[in-house]
Interface confidence: low
């Protein structure tokens, strides 16, 4: 019996031994994608579906509220600035927008998990694309912030201040454009699909196995590994420079950005490790069995929930780590509550150091 994963990939003896019981190591080949036959049957999803039904709607609802409030507050604070936004603030504003748009899709996914997808194929494509656009945008914008800091501090190059203010906007547009490109498969392949086994309709991909694996690899690399590597590289160099210059104030100013990067890593690493296991199963490097698949499905639900938590985490980090954000937020609340008290509308200082709540004239983070 010939055991092949696809026309291009033949299993080796070790993999054949592991998969001897099955016709194929993976069960999701499209009719035109691979000429292999016949597949292992889809696994029963009772446990993972029941888990999702109980766990996801509650989590998504909570994240929706927290994310909307938190990121709304960040956007409000940034947009209430009288002066032009600094490069980092602009990136943070875009990050808040990305996080807000992502959490806006969560109620739809909560309904999908609790009951079924009742919103049709059009909204399935839009919600899926919106979700992924903002997943990628969040990671890439954090990488942009770290690269901006790196240029400013390590190379003393104020890329976005020397050139026209439009440069940071162009960078953000490039990020959004790239994310839109990454989300093309969502627009093309996502649809509301009726699952006969579950007797329910769900918003899911309908494309060949190789495409699914490629998309997961893209998500892993472009949405996690690359941004994380950029962040790690940039901040390692920044910290080295600051330690050498013994800039205690500047080191203190780096607190927020280090915490934001650590939060990104902590929130998304578990999910991407699970995705990696899934990729390995897709490729046949790990034998696929129903027990493992069920555990991976549940792990994916839990770790993706942790990942989406990151959308709500940034505002909280700003609030608890960033002194200036608290000041600005407090002032904004007072201004909204007491519109007649003109004294409260006054900016604390017109100096460049206070013109932003994330940057200082020394091109590092302020005390926040």
């Amino acid at each position: 019996m010939v055991l092949e994963v696809s026309d291009h990939q033949v299993l080796n003896d070790a993999e054949v031994a592991a998969l001897l019981e099955n016709f194929s190591s993976s069960y999701d080949y499209g009719e035109n994608e691979s000429d292999s036959c016949c597949t292992s049957p889809p696994c029963p999803q009772d446990f993972s579906l029941n888990f999702d039904r109980a766990f996801l709607p509650a989590l998504y609802s909570l994240l929706f509220l927290l994310g909307l409030l938190g990121n709304g507050a960040v956007a409000a604070v940034l947009l209430s600035r009288r002066t032009a936004l600094s490069s980092t603030d602009t990136f943070l504003l875009h990050l808040a927008v990305a996080d807000t748009l992502l959490v806006l899709t969560l109620p739809l996914w909560a309904v999908d998990a609790a009951v079924q997808w009742v919103f049709g194929s059009g909204l399935c494509k839009v919600a899926g694309a919106l979700f992924n656009i903002n997943f990628y945008a969040g990671a890439l914008l954090l990488a942009c912030i770290s690269f901006d800091r790196y240029l400013n501090i390590v190379h003393a190059t104020q890329l976005y201040r020397r050139g026209p203010p439009a440069r940071v906007t162009l960078t953000c547009l490039a990020v959004w454009g790239l994310c839109l490109l990454f989300a093309l498969p969502d627009f093309i392949f996502l649809s509301a699909h009726h699952d006969e086994r579950l007797n329910a309709t769900h918003c899911q991909y309908n494309f060949p196995q190789v495409g699914r694996t490629a998309l997961r690899v893209l998500q892993l690399v472009a949405g996690f590994l690359l941004p994380l590597l950029v962040m790690a590289y940039c901040y390692a160099h920044i910290l080295a420079v600051l330690l050498v210059s013994r800039g205690q104030r500047r080191l203190r100013a780096m607190r927020l950005v280090v915490v934001v990067v650590v939060a990104f890593a902590l929130c998304w690493t578990p999910y991407h490790l699970v995705v990696l296991v899934d990729i390995l199963m897709d490729l046949g490097a790990l034998a696929r069995n129903c027990g493992r698949e069920s555990r991976v499905d549940v792990a994916k639900s839990v770790t993706s929930g942790l990942g989406y938590m990151h959308c709500c985490l940034n505002p909280l980090l700003y609030a608890f780590v960033g002194v200036k954000f608290r000041e600005r937020m407090w002032m904004l609340l007072l201004r909204l509550g007491c519109p007649n008290q003109r004294g409260l509308q006054r900016q604390p200082s017109s100096s460049r150091r206070d013109s932003s709540w994330s940057e200082t004239s020394e091109a590092s983070y302020s005390g926040l």
Epitope: D7, E21, F23, E31, D35, F207
Partner: antibody, heavy 123, light 106 residues
Framework: EVQLLESGGGLVQPGGSLRLSCAAS????????MSWVRQAPGKGLEWVAT????????YYPDSVKGRFTISRDNAKNTLYLQMNSLRAEDTAVYYC????????????????WGQGTLVTVSS | DIQLTQSPSFLSASVGDRVTITCRAS?????LYWYQQKPGKAPKLWIY???TLASGVPSRFSGSGSGNEYTLTISSLQPEDFATYYC?????????FGQGTKLEIK
């Protein structure tokens, strides 16, 4: 309407050969994996061979491996089973059957069957 | 190979009876598939993915089970239900069928 029509059955001596054909109509033959399943008189069903939709991959149980060869001609919408070194225990009604596609995946059960052709191996 | 054992092999029942056919697997299977066959005819897909009725199958039929034990139940037997029923697995190669359960009129 999906139709599968087997032919080529008959009486053959032990050690002899026979080639069965299955003419398919009513569906896009090139998109489906196909199989042969047999049923000895008064007995249960036994899977004999499977071929992928493009004809590149074939699968057999140990009982017929090396003796039977499944093939297809997608241009003619026809499935074949070449049976060599026939034994008395190969006597059965041979059905050709279609594998369904579920969510883009080939499934190992059979959604349509032909009426069968009887193969008798006897001296 | 996974062996499928159906019980009973023969079953005599009357119209209106509730009938249950069991299929036991020698090792766990993910799903089970059921076929109906009438004398001189080709088998017909009856139930797939353990519990999904094939097109045209009356709702009095139901399938259930998991792991090693699966059942096909007919809530109220009708004259056209008298036939032989086979279970099948394709969790592992080779595809195997049960020996069949012949349902006869009492």
């Amino acid at each position: 309407e999906v139709q599968l029509l087997e032919s080529g059955g008959g009486l053959v001596q032990p050690g002899g050969s026979l080639r069965l054909s299955c003419a398919a109509s009513g569906f896009t033959f090139t998109s489906y994996a196909m199989s042969w399943v047999r049923q000895a008189p008064g007995k249960g069903l036994e899977w004999v061979a499977t071929i992928s939709h493009g004809g590149k991959y074939t699968y057999y149980p140990d009982s017929v491996k090396g003796r039977f060869t499944i093939s297809r001609d997608n241009a003619k919408n026809t499935l074949y089973l070449q049976m060599n070194s026939l034994r008395a225990e190969d006597t059965a009604v041979y059905y050709c059957a279609r594998h369904p596609i579920y969510s883009g995946n080939y499934q190992g059960y059979f959604d349509y069957w032909g009426q069968g052709t009887l193969v008798t191996v006897s001296s | 190979d996974i062996q499928l054992t159906q019980s009973p092999s023969f079953l005599s029942a009357s119209v209106g009876d509730r009938v249950t056919i069991t299929c036991r697997a020698s090792s766990g299977v993910n799903y089970l598939y059921w076929y109906q066959q009438k004398p001189g005819k080709a088998p017909k897909l009856w139930i797939y993915f353990t519990s999904t009725l094939a097109s045209g199958v009356p709702s009095r039929f139901s399938g259930s089970g998991s792991g090693n034990e699966y059942t096909l139940t007919i809530s109220s037997l009708q004259p056209e239900d008298f036939a032989t029923y086979y279970c099948q697995q394709f969790t592992s190669s080779p595809y195997t069928f049960g020996q069949g359960t012949k349902l006869e009129i009492k």
